[in-house]
Interface confidence: low
């Protein structure tokens, strides 16, 4: 064999005995008839030698080290060559070593061509025997970044201040290229950055520097993961140890592009994030260790990349092509205060553009899918405007306020479906007629259904909330003077099962002056609770509302008010209540700002309750709660 090393190539070749074997017959390197067991060849030297045995690979190994100095001159960046060529070397287990020294401010990047690298732990070996051992440097201390095989995900490793790369090739391996190149980068301000690229499903096991020994004190190491947007990544820690910190805390930080809470900080003992969509970074940060009893920080973890589970593979069609003035938003439910990372939860349009919230508008058919570990973290809010601009066209026209079935079939809970009902001012009013009579939500008789209708004025300057109403009561219809919003709000997933109970029809009717009229047809044996609009804030100034209460022929109604006085104090005008029998037109008038409220009274025929407010002084608002109870007549008084 002849090995000739060019002058100033900075290459040293060393042939030495490998691990001792139990072979009886020794083997030597023969050079100029001398028998030696170690041969060193330096730059500019040419050596001819042979071996004294037929299978030198069982006895010797060869190390080829090239020193690359980036301190004093330009760096030879680009694809790294195997020098001397493997064809010129004896067939021994060989290790090519590149030792690159650079300034602290210079970043060095090793770029691995396909196949990329797979990190292995202590005691593991590579199937083909080809290993890459990479180490860095902190001042004078060598830090092992890791040992890697082929056929993995690691595509780039960035370091600064220097890098030592050792490529070990078994004697029988035909490889004749290094498989990597070196590039210079700006300072990375940390020990190293390892880039791991997933092109499809798969997993990668990675380790902190020096594993299984301790990670260098107060250092920072980052892994960058490149994951296709349609796949999910989950991180799990296979093994870790914490050192004894004197200052700062050991932690991992996740950086997810587009997240509003970067970086997400975790303790190593925390459950690590899963179901992340797209690229992310993970960083391990050490601490200042106790000098007397430092302990060790080490971490071995796995990243699993797979297709999203369950709902994520399904495509849902939301057909809003026949809708007008409607928008549907799928968004995260509000969560309070937790700084813990939660896996990404995304909704995707056409399976391509994924974001944490998505708004669909009417006039089109939309295909959506979900990338989310727990769809209960999302909800839907829908707004639809029904407006009438021409009173001649709209009068007596009716619209059904129902949640379209396409929306009900989505795997995300509906939170609010709001209809904004707009009428021409002073021309038309509205009447709401439910499929099932409604109950008004009160503290005394709360709604316990899976949904309610929230009815409020939609006039910007008017703060008027009529109340919350749910199926299963006695309110037959609600008439309102002007623009309102009706919001179907769900309170439980069981709304899907109860959806058939929803159903409200709105009709445009001739204009009337009262703010609202409730038509109440009580059922026997149940107490109906009714309260004035804007319960918590008080009926707005100069507002009038009425209740039309039906009493069947064979029943008597007991009307009961729940406090002695209304509590209202008028600044201007008077607040009053009129109770009027519908058949005889006989009426009682009560001054609400002066009189006590009436004692329980009995009504044998249908009657009106009308409440009109004054302009109250602040803090002395008009809030009234009353009930109507039907009992059978004991004596026929007709």
């Amino acid at each position: 064999f002849e090995i000739a090393l060019p002058r100033e190539s900075n290459i040293t070749v060393l042939i030495k005995l490998g691990t001792p074997t139990l072979l009886a017959k020794p083997c030597y390197i023969v050079i100029s008839k001398r028998h030696i067991t170690m041969l060193s060849i330096k730059s500019g030297e040419r050596i001819v030698f042979t071996f004294s045995c037929q299978s030198p690979e069982n006895h010797f190994v060869i190390e080829i080290q090239k020193n690359i100095d980036c301190m004093s001159g330009p760096c030879p960046f680009g694809e790294v060559q195997l020098q001397p060529s493997t064809s010129l070397l004896p067939t021994l287990n060989r290790t090519f070593i590149w030792d690159v020294k650079a300034h602290k401010s210079i970043g060095l990047e090793l770029q691995f061509s396909i196949p990329r690298l797979r990190q292995i732990g202590p005691g593991e070996s590579c199937p083909d025997g080809v290993t890459h051992s990479i180490s860095g440097r902190i001042d004078a201390t060598v830090v092992r970044i890791g040992t890697f095989c082929s056929n993995g995900t690691v595509s780039r490793i960035k370091m600064q201040e220097g890098v030592k790369m050792a490529l070990h090739l078994p004697w029988f391996h035909p490889r004749n290229v290094s498989g990597f190149s070196i590039a210079n980068r700006s300072s990375i301000k940390r020990l190293c950055i390892i880039e791991s690229v997933f092109e499809g499903e798969g997993s990668a096991t990675l380790m902190s520097a020096n594993y299984p020994e301790g990670f260098p004190e107060d250092e920072l190491m980052t892994w960058q993961f490149v994951v296709p947007a349609h796949l999910r990544a989950s991180v799990s820690f296979l093994n870790f140890n914490l050192s004894n910190c004197e200052r700062k805390e050991e932690r991992v930080e996740y950086y997810i592009p587009g997240s509003t809470t970067n970086p997400e900080v975790f303790k190593l003992e925390d459950k690590q994030p899963g179901n992340m969509a797209g690229n992310f970074n993970l960083s391990l940060q050490g601490c200042d260790q106790d000098a007397q009893s430092p302990g060790i920080l080490r971490l071995q973890f796995q990243v699993l990349v797979q297709h999203p589970q369950n709902e994520s593979n399904k495509i849902y069609v939301v057909d809003l092509s026949n809708e007008r003035a409607m928008s549907l938003t799928i968004e995260p439910r509000p969560v309070k205060q937790s700084r813990k990372f939660v896996p990404g939860c995304f909704v995707c349009l056409e399976s391509r553009t994924c974001s944490s919230n998505l708004t669909l508008t009417s006039g089109s058919k939309h295909k959506i899918s979900f990338l989310c570990d727990d769809l209960t973290r999302l909800w839907m809010n829908v707004e639809k405007t029904i407006s009438c601009t021409d009173h001649r066209y709209c009068q007596r026209k009716s619209y059904s306020l129902q949640v379209p079935s396409d929306i009900l079939h989505l795997p995300v809970e509906l939170h609010d479906f709001s209809w904004k009902l707009l009428v021409p001012k002073d021309r038309l009013s509205l009447v709401l007629v439910p499929a099932q009579k409604l109950q008004q939500h009160t503290h005394e008789k709360p709604c316990n259904t899976s949904f309610s209708y929230l009815v409020a004025s939609a006039i910007p300057s008017q703060d008027l909330y009529f109340g919350s109403f749910c199926p299963g009561g006695s309110i037959k219809q609600i008439q309102v003077k002007q623009n309102i919003s009706v919001t179907l709000r769900t309170f439980a997933p069981s709304f899907q099962q109860e959806a058939s109970r929803q159903g409200l029809t709105v009709s445009f009717i001739p204009y009337f002056k009262e703010e609202g009229v409730f038509t109440v047809t009580p059922d026997t044996k149940s107490k109906v609770y009714l309260r004035t609009p804007n319960w918590d804030r008080g009926l707005p100034s100069l507002t009038s509302v009425s209740w039309n209460i039906s009493v069947p022929r064979d029943q008597v109604a007991c009307l009961t008010f729940f406090k002695e006085r209304s509590g209202v104090v008028c600044q201007t005008g008077r607040a009053f209540m009129i109770i009027q029998e519908q058949r005889t037109r006989a009426e009682e008038i009560f001054s609400l700002d002066e009189d006590v409220l009436p004692k329980p009274s009995f009504h044998h025929h249908s009657f009106w309750v009308n409440i009109s407010n004054c302009s109250p002084t602040s803090g002395k608002q008009l809030d009234l709660l009353f009930s109507v109870t039907l009992t059978p007549r004991t004596v026929d008084l007709t």
Epitope: E253, T260, T261, N262, P263, V265, K336, Q337, S338, R339
Partner: antibody
């Protein structure tokens, strides 16, 4: 309206303890995190830590671990800062402030409590 | 931890002039930076959130720029009531840190 009202000034001797209160009104205490900030005489602002008002879990900056304790009494909508083994360098104005969102900006502040430690 | 460096330490201006206050972070902190104003004997007051978002009730002459690691608070035309100390605050990661402050004084 939202208000954070802190307890009055305190004069303490080294080695003693002090407990500063911060009463929240005009909003639900548990809907926002509560943070504490120190300002030594003539100096800048130092973030001390925060308390998760839903769980009561405190988090401290490194320089405020050990002698400083953040606590809460939701029944009276009040957050507390207790400092034990007082030192002269603890002389400062201590502010409580309400944290908004996950990456807090402090939209409401208490008026501050001056704690003076002198022998 | 994120170190915030404010400059200048003191800025002397006359009313009506434009004030430019700088805050530099030791690393990129996206837009997780807020600005506060503090007058003697008072608690700080939030001026700008998330680098450039305005706060209700704060005059429009206050504006901020970002994101990244270099941030600026600009007062387009300084009013007499604007003379105070201004602090930037990082909300990027624990611990939340403040800059050392810039004092805006009357020239």
């Amino acid at each position: 309206q939202v208000q954070l009202v802190q307890s009055g000034s305190e004069l303490k001797k080294p080695g003693e303890s002090v407990k500063v209160s911060c009463k929240a009104s005009g909003y639900t205490l548990t809907d926002f995190s509560m943070h504490w900030v120190r300002q030594a005489p003539g100096q800048g602002l130092e973030w001390m830590g925060w308390i998760n008002t839903e769980t009561g879990a405190p988090t401290y900056a490194d320089d405020f671990k050990g002698r400083f304790v953040l606590s809460l009494d939701t029944s009276v909508s009040t957050a507390y800062l207790q400092i034990s083994s007082l030192k002269s360098e603890d002389t400062a104005v201590y502010y409580c402030s309400r944290g908004r969102d996950y990456d807090p900006h402090f939209d409401y502040w208490g008026q501050g409590t001056l704690v003076t430690v002198s022998s | 931890e994120i170190v915030l460096t404010q400059s200048p330490a003191t800025l002397s201006l006359s009313p009506g002039e434009r004030a430019t206050l700088s805050c530099r972070a030791s690393q990129s902190i996206s837009d997780f930076l807020h600005w506060y104003q503090q007058k003697p004997g008072q608690a700080p007051r939030l001026l700008i959130k998330y680098a450039s978002q305005s706060i209700s009730g704060i005059p429009a002459r206050f504006s901020g720029s970002g994101p990244g690691s270099d941030f600026t608070l600009t007062i387009s035309s300084v009013e007499p009531e604007d003379f105070a100390v201004y602090y930037c605050q990082s909300a990027h990661s624990f611990p939340y840190t403040f800059g050392q402050g810039t004092k805006l004084e009357i020239k």
